[in-house]
């Protein structure tokens, strides 16, 4: 039975981020309803992606370690689309963390997931990066710029926004 | 050559105020992080608080906060620590240290030959 | 904060032996094979010096008998072999994140 197996396969995959998901917000992709795009609840989904808001206060390589350890990674930002809908959810007193850093103090900035770093596709405030020891990137609010890039010392606490993949099933 | 002079350590009743300053000079005090670490008689070393190139980062352990200042003036290639409602538990050696970051975090590569604080009545 | 365990507190060593002295984290001090750990020596009257940044870089001017191992959790500084001017105590301290933390040291006798 089609409908049986198709069942079985999903209570399988379910089962899979049951660990660290327990619960999962699901939607129908497009007509078919045997697609099913997830995220886990309560992170929030744009496009392909999830997105968590972490709180706690953490370095750099923690939050990037407590990303990971629910399956994600530290947020890395391809659109100024994907940054609009981002910032819906911050705080504007606040700084968050994303997936990139400068580990080598020689400005050559790293995605986490090992996306190219495309100079053209950056947010940064005015300024910035400006300190060879800021080695890891946040994005924060400023009234004069609104909501930018700015680089920080890694071991200094941030929130932090982690991103995965939508689980489809 | 990398000294770092610290001055300013002496006798203080509990609930006094003292100022430590620390002079650098042998490299561009303004390109690097800078920490106070202090050290009780006979015990180990404790971090105290840390100040940013830049300025624009500060940070202390909870056993110090709200009483002890990090600053620092880089034309005068001078670090300072203002220490208010000093305790008896303050009483150490202070150490001026310069960090050196490396990767995500830093180390402290020159140490100068501290200052003694004593605080009793 | 990272509490360092630092062990034995303290050890007496012959003049040409090994010295071996481990710091414990309690929890990983590491991130993609890079481990912030460090190691000073004091010698008494003295402020700390580095010796040892990143668990395993000999720093500039460090006799090579010191030499630094470990990862994650578990660091171990070396001496071999010990020479009488290396009566001292020896600190590890991490930086992975803030608050920047000292272990209590150990202290090392030579006989």
């Known amino acids: 039975n089609f409908m049986y197996s198709k069942t079985v396969k999903r209570l399988s995959k379910l089962r899979e981020y049951q660990q660290y998901h327990p619960s999962l917000t699901c939607v129908m992709e497009g007509k078919d309803i045997e697609d099913w795009s997830c995220c886990p609840t309560p992170w929030t989904s744009f496009q392909s992606s999830c997105y968590f808001i972490s709180t706690g206060m953490q370095s750099w390589t923690k939050s990037q370690k407590n990303c990971s350890v629910m399956g994600a990674d530290l947020v890395v930002i391809n659109t100024r689309e994907e940054q609009d809908f981002i910032i819906q959810n911050l705080k504007r007193n606040s700084s968050y963390f994303l997936g990139l850093s400068d580990p080598g103090g020689r400005r050559h900035w790293q995605w986490v997931d090992q996306t190219p770093y495309n100079e053209n596709v950056t947010f940064w405030h005015s300024g910035e990066p400006n300190n060879l020891d800021e080695r890891c990137a946040i994005i924060n609010f400023r009234s004069s710029e609104e909501w930018g890039w700015n680089d920080i010392h890694c071991h200094v606490p941030q929130k932090s926004i982690c991103k995965m993949k939508k689980i489809y099933i | 050559e990398v000294q770092l002079v610290e001055s300013g350590g002496g006798l203080v009743k509990p609930g006094g105020s003292l100022r430590l300053s620390c002079a650098a000079s042998?490299?561009?005090?303004?390109?690097?992080?800078m920490s106070w670490v202090r050290q009780a008689p006979g015990k180990g070393l404790e971090w105290v608080s840390t100040i940013s190139s830049g300025d624009s980062y500060t940070y202390y352990p909870d056993s110090v906060k709200g009483r002890f200042t990090i600053s620092r003036d880089n034309a005068k290639n001078s670090l300072y620590l203002q220490m208010n409602s000093l305790r008896a538990e303050d009483t150490a050696v202070y150490y001026c240290?310069?960090?050196?970051?490396?990767?995500?975090?830093?180390?402290?590569?020159?140490w100068g030959q501290g200052t003694t604080v004593t605080v009793s009545s | 904060d990272i509490v360092l365990t630092q062990s034995p507190a303290s050890l007496a060593v012959s003049p040409g032996q090994r010295a071996t002295i481990t710091c414990r984290a309690s929890?990983?001090?590491?991130?993609?094979?890079?481990?912030?750990m460090h190691w000073y020596q004091q010698k008494p009257g003295q402020p700390p010096k580095l010796l040892i940044y990143a668990a395993s870089n000999l720093e500039s001017g460090v006799p090579a008998r010191f030499s630094g191992s470990g990862s994650e959790t578990d660091f171990t500084l070396t001496i071999n072999p010990v020479e009488a001017e290396d009566t001292a105590n020896y600190y590890c301290?991490?930086?992975?994140?803030?608050?920047?933390?000292f272990g209590g040291g150990t202290k090392v006798e030579i006989k």
């Open positions: 042998g490299f561009t005090f303004s390109s690097y992080g």
């Open positions: 240290a310069r960090q050196l970051y490396y990767s995500y975090g830093y180390y402290f590569d020159y």
């Open positions: 301290q991490q930086s992975i994140e803030d608050p920047p933390t």
């Open positions: 929890e990983s001090v590491s991130f993609h094979g890079t481990h912030l």
